[in-house]
């Protein structure tokens, strides 16, 4: 069907809606996908949990924003904030960033299309 | 080598309607975002519209939005933009251009520019 | 009045440095990619930068494009007198749902 788009809503809204929800089971599965269980990550303990729940618990999580599709780009962005600051080298910024990048399509979402997730300045 | 060229400006009345196109050559058309952008004399860049691969997507200017309508030829290799209800500041160069844009993870970005079309808006 | 915030003009001497900057806020610049584009007197805009920092085949390295928070810069070293020309910046606005261009900087080499 053709659609022609207006106007998606405002960002400060979407950055409301990120506010409210639970972004924690988002960053341990990612965390989990590319740390493994490797006993260095152990500032949430990722191993009590599967990372098939974790999955589910972060697109529940992400499914209770109103606007879940509009959002996503913000949700993405505040989940690569957050962990910014534990990523140890270049090389786990681009594995976490990979996998971030994943997760709208694990969750059954459309991926973003214009988002940039490089949100830190240059700190990841 | 990758050519645009845009057709169709000329002088209107305000109030008047001109359909500009624009013949694009040497990459596969169909593959790629289109955009109108334009130039007032003397004036910045103002994008204008975007229009997705399949014309299934449209984006507009505020102030062209129910005056201006994008649509592409993918087997004429053609974009076209049919401007009614014409204002004198609607007067600017109009380019076509070719969008990078992806379905994911990137930006708009116009890479490759016509050589612009004059439309003059005047009584 | 553009929604981002370019100088009107830069000037610098033949094989220095310059930058320009585009100030912008967190549904444009903040959330999405910057590019940037030379315009030569009398002819149509020419792509430098995309994606905040990537530069297109052709486009020598003495350009540059970063981006920080809400604001993006074009750095330019070994400035020439071809450089002379005017620099735009663009992105995506989320809430205008729409792409938009900075003023325009005029870049004039002393």
């Known amino acids: 069907m053709r659609r022609e788009r207006g106007r998606q809503g405002d960002s400060s809204s979407c950055e409301r809606q990120v506010d409210r929800v639970n972004l924690k089971p988002c960053e341990q599965h990612i965390m989990q996908r590319i740390m493994g269980e490797q006993e260095q990550y152990d500032s949430y303990d990722i191993r009590s949990t599967r990372s098939s729940d974790q999955q589910q618990r972060c697109c529940d999580e992400l499914n209770e924003m109103e606007n879940t599709q509009r959002c996503m780009c913000e949700a993405l962005q505040q989940i690569m904030e957050n962990q910014c600051d534990r990523l140890q080298d270049r090389q786990m910024v681009q594995q976490f960033k990979r996998e971030l990048m994943n997760l709208p399509q694990q969750c059954n979402f459309r991926a973003p299309q214009r988002c940039d997730l490089d949100v830190s300045g240059g700190r990841c | 080598e990758v050519q645009l060229v845009e057709s169709g400006g000329g002088l209107v009345q305000p109030g008047g309607s001109l359909r500009l196109s624009c013949a694009a050559s040497g990459f596969k058309f169909s593959t790629f975002y289109m955009t109108w952008v334009r130039q007032a004399p003397g004036k910045g860049l103002e994008w204008v519209a975007n229009?997705?691969?399949?014309?299934?997507?449209?984006d507009y200017l505020d102030s062209v939005r129910g005056r201006f309508t994008i649509s592409r030829d993918n087997a004429k290799n053609s974009l076209y933009l049919q401007m009614n209800s014409l204002r004198a500041e609607d007067t600017a160069v109009y380019y076509c251009?070719?969008?990078?844009?992806?379905?994911?993870?990137?930006?708009?970005?116009?890479?490759?520019w016509g050589q612009g079309t004059l439309v003059t808006v005047s009584s | 009045q553009s929604v981002l915030t370019q100088p009107p003009s830069v000037s610098a001497a033949p094989g220095q440095k310059v930058t320009i900057s585009c100030s912008g806020t967190g549904s444009n610049i903040g959330h999405n990619y910057v590019s940037w584009y030379q315009q030569l007197p009398g002819t149509a805009p020419k792509l430098l930068i995309y994606d905040n920092t990537k530069r297109p085949s052709g486009i020598p390295d003495r350009f540059s494009g970063s981006k920080s928070g809400t604001s993006a810069t074009l750095g330019i070293t070994g400035l020439q007198t071809g450089d002379e020309a005017d620099y735009y910046c663009?992105?995506?606005?989320?809430?205008?749902?729409?792409?938009?261009f900075g003023g325009g900087t005029k870049l004039t080499v002393l």
């Open positions: 251009t070719r969008n990078g844009l992806q379905d994911s993870y990137s930006g708009d970005f116009f890479d490759h």
């Open positions: 663009a992105t995506w606005d989320a809430d205008l749902s729409a792409v938009l």
């Open positions: 229009i997705k691969q399949d014309g299934s997507e449209k």
